[in-house]
Interface confidence: low
């Protein structure tokens, strides 16, 4: 679609006549009829093909054309076709006298032709004009022609329509050939594309509008390259979403079990070896000197009995140093001067000669030790109680006070807060993990269903014939106080009239 | 002389699918769209969505995007429209027409294709 | 997605009458995507109006749209004996593409 423009610029016709050679009576009022038609090695009659247009008086024999100057005829005249232009054309251009007001072909005398003249030929599409200068005998008439493309019509034969939009259907202007050049943000065939943010992460991050970084399910930051970890993940990461990879020494579905209670707490002090035993639970292993579940408690070097066969310690600056009873000697009292005749078995134990009675050794009885059976045996020195248990001597045998929370012979084993039964009236515990939860039958509320909410038992009316009903709140039951002439739990049988029994 | 010429009227069975093919001439195919767009007997006209012969991009009705697949074949200048999965809600008559991406019009229409879908 | 609805929902009148079609939507829509159809019973729609108030080729004068944003108006000048069928508006300015249900001319 595209418009042939011709703009008229001068005519000449200085003897004012027609093309019978007749004079115009007065002047020559003149006015011009153009037909413009597909291309003919020879122009002849026939229809104006590309479209015909006509002007209204412009001038008097001699005149200058101005533009616009033609009144309901614009001047460039416009010849607007609809189809791919073809690249040629044959013009016909007719100049005429008007004797009166009517322009109309039939309304003219047939002598009323001042010129014609024909031409043809190949045209581009273009803004640039061709001048062109035509004479005949008598006149002479200068213009100028092109064609462009009509609105939305671009190329070589104003054959490609490109409307430029910028809407949901695509976002560009048109190029010269009709090409589509897509506004800035926006890219694809039809522009409908947005450019997102610049790095939003191809398959994570999507946009609805260019510099957006819009992100999918499961993605966070602002080019949707984090991942978001699984709801409630304390102590872990995710490389794809919805993960919980726990982070070392954590553990459980959402990482917040603690199994490097060592490492994130540090409970043993003084040098002491840390050791995890188990969820939250660890053992200190002592340095020497020290003492206690976390190795707390400093020791005097005397308080591991170094000195043997009864003798006393006494503390020193750079150790300790051991007095020994009569008949023993050495750092620790170890060695013996004595012999089975001097009884050295405290405690009710044995001797026993050896090497031909120049020694001996003591067999203790149970609960004691040491060459002399001197020692009460100590069966927590070896801190056996898991989980901060404390270690009790108890005769021949040893036991573990648990903390709470914790049970089996040496505190190994993790309670159930529910074992103990918490929830009162029937309730049904749930172990959480910070404590319990009871769930309450009817009749009971309260954090161990220790609270009676009382049900009105006579709500659903099971007294007949008026009789009064009462609740015992003590057994959330109720009790019908029968009016005269009826018995029976509910009042429901009249006097006289006893329920038939079937035996 | 622009014309849309559909083809003939098909009976399915619920579950199946239904190609309808869309046979386009007296302009040049690729400087348009062709929408199809459906009536159920009795009821008003319903968009499917719509095919640019120029590119192949599609733009479907949310409704059909599952089940629908637009085509055309620029050598034959045809469009076809496939739906699958039919159920006895899909009986209609189905159009195809020429759309303008400038100026938004439909036009001409096809004469329409029915299809009834019955156990 | 844009519903248009149309009213009245049926007319009845006479040869000559002056017709006035209503298409209001449920939010704007430029006027270059409002297009009026005609549908004749057993026939495909026909395009009359589009861009709001361009009239498509081959369609008399009598036919004439206008309208902007929500409200969008069909009207027949003089109604002739073969524009007695059913007037459907329709926009593509939102995706999904709707149309209304339609207002049917009867004879009075």
């Known amino acids: 679609s595209g418009v042939f423009q011709l703009q008229l610029q001068e005519f000449i016709n200085e003897r004012g006549v027609l093309a019978s050679g007749r004079p115009c009576e007065p002047g020559c009022r003149t006015f011009f009829r153009v037909c413009l038609k597909h291309f003919q090695a020879v122009v002849s009659p026939g229809p104006c093909t590309f479209g015909t247009v006509s002007t209204p008086v412009l001038g008097t024999n001699s005149f200058a054309v101005r533009d616009d100057s033609s009144g309901g005829g614009r001047n460039p005249l416009q010849l607007p076709f609809n189809f791919t232009w073809p690249g040629t054309f044959s013009l016909i251009i007719e100049a005429w006298h008007a004797p009166g007001d009517d322009l109309r072909p039939e309304a003219l005398p047939p002598d009323a032709l001042i010129s014609k003249i024909a031409i043809q030929g190949s045209l581009a599409v273009g803004q640039n004009w061709l001048l062109d200068e035509q004479t005949s005998t008598l006149t002479r008439l200068r213009y100028s022609y092109r064609v462009i493309c009509s609105d939305n019509y671009y190329g070589d034969n104003c054959s490609r329509l490109c409307k430029k939009r910028n809407d949901h259907f695509g976002h560009y202007v048109c190029q010269p050939d009709g090409n589509l050049s897509c506004l800035p943000g926006w890219t694809g065939e039809y522009c409908q594309q947005p450019i997102c943010l610049s790095g939003c992460h191809e398959q994570n991050g999507y946009c609805s509008k260019p510099a957006e970084c819009l992100c999918r399910p499961g993605w966070q930051g602002r080019l949707c390259n984090e991942c978001i970890p699984h709801n409630g993940c304390r102590h872990g990461t995710c490389s794809t979403p919805w993960q919980c990879t726990c982070d070392e020494g954590w553990g459980g579905l959402f990482c917040d079990q603690d199994l490097n209670y060592c490492t994130h707490h540090s409970p043993c002090k003084n040098g002491a070896t840390c050791s995890n035993s188990g969820q939250r639970s660890y053992t200190c292993t002592c340095r020497p000197g020290y003492t206690g579940v976390d190795c707390e408690l400093e020791l005097s070097e005397c308080d591991s009995n170094p000195c043997r066969n009864g003798g006393s310690c006494k503390d020193q600056e750079d150790g300790y140093h051991c007095l020994c009873p009569p008949g023993y000697y050495g750092l620790h009292c170890e060695h013996s001067t004595l012999s089975c005749a001097d009884s050295p078995c405290f405690n009710g134990g044995s001797c026993r000669e050896r090497n031909q009675g120049a020694n001996y050794a003591c067999e203790c009885p149970p609960n004691f030790t040491g060459s002399n059976c001197e020692k009460k045996v100590d069966r927590c020195t070896s801190n056996p109680c898991a989980n901060g248990g404390q270690c009790l001597n108890r005769g021949p045998s040893r036991m573990c006070r648990c903390r709470p929370g914790f049970t089996g012979t040496y505190c190994e084993l993790h309670v159930s807060d529910c074992a103990r039964n918490p929830c009162a009236h029937g309730g049904t515990c749930h172990d959480l993990e910070n404590g319990l939860m009871c769930t309450c039958p009817a009749g009971f509320s309260g954090r161990r269903c220790e609270v009676r909410t009382s049900i009105d038992a006579c709500a659903s009316s099971p007294c007949f014939n008026r009789a009064t009903c009462y609740t015992d709140l003590s057994t959330d039951t109720f009790v019908c106080n029968c009016p005269y002439g009826f018995v029976g739990s509910r009042c429901e049988f009249p006097v006289g009239l006893p329920p038939s029994f079937p035996w | 002389q622009v014309h849309l010429v559909q083809s003939g009227a098909e009976v399915k069975k619920p579950g199946a699918s239904v190609k309808v093919s869309c046979r386009a001439s007296?302009?040049?195919?690729?400087?348009?769209?062709i929408t199809w767009v459906r009536q159920a007997p009795g009821q008003g006209l319903e968009w499917m969505g719509w095919i640019s012969a120029y590119s192949g991009n599609t733009d479907y009705a949310q409704k059909f995007q599952a089940r629908i697949t637009m085509t055309t074949d620029t050598s034959t200048t045809t469009a076809y429209m496939e739906l699958r999965s039919l159920t006895s809600d899909d009986t209609a008559v189905y159009y195809c027409?020429?759309?303008?991406?400038?100026?938004?019009?439909?036009?001409?229409w096809g004469q329409g294709t029915l299809v009834t879908v019955s156990s | 997605e844009i519903v248009l609805t149309q009213s009245p929902g049926t007319l009845s009148l006479s040869p000559g009458d002056r017709v006035t079609l209503s298409c209001r939507a449920s939010q704007s829509v430029s006027s270059s995507y409002l297009a009026w159809y005609q549908q004749k019973p057993g026939q495909a729609p026909r395009l009359l109006i589009y861009?709001?108030?361009s009239r498509a080729t081959g369609i008399p004068d009598r036919f004439s749209g206008s309208g902007s944003g929500t409200d969008f108006t069909l009207t027949i000048s003089s109604l002739e004996p073969e524009d007695f069928a059913v007037y459907y508006c329709?926009?593509?300015?939102?995706?999904?593409?709707?149309f209304g249900q339609g207002t049917r001319v009867e004879i009075k």
């Open positions: 861009g709001a108030s």
């Open positions: 007296g302009y040049t195919f690729t400087n348009y769209g």
């Open positions: 027409a020429r759309y303008s991406w400038n100026f938004h019009w439909f036009d001409p």
């Open positions: 329709q926009q593509c300015g939102g995706s999904p593409w709707t």
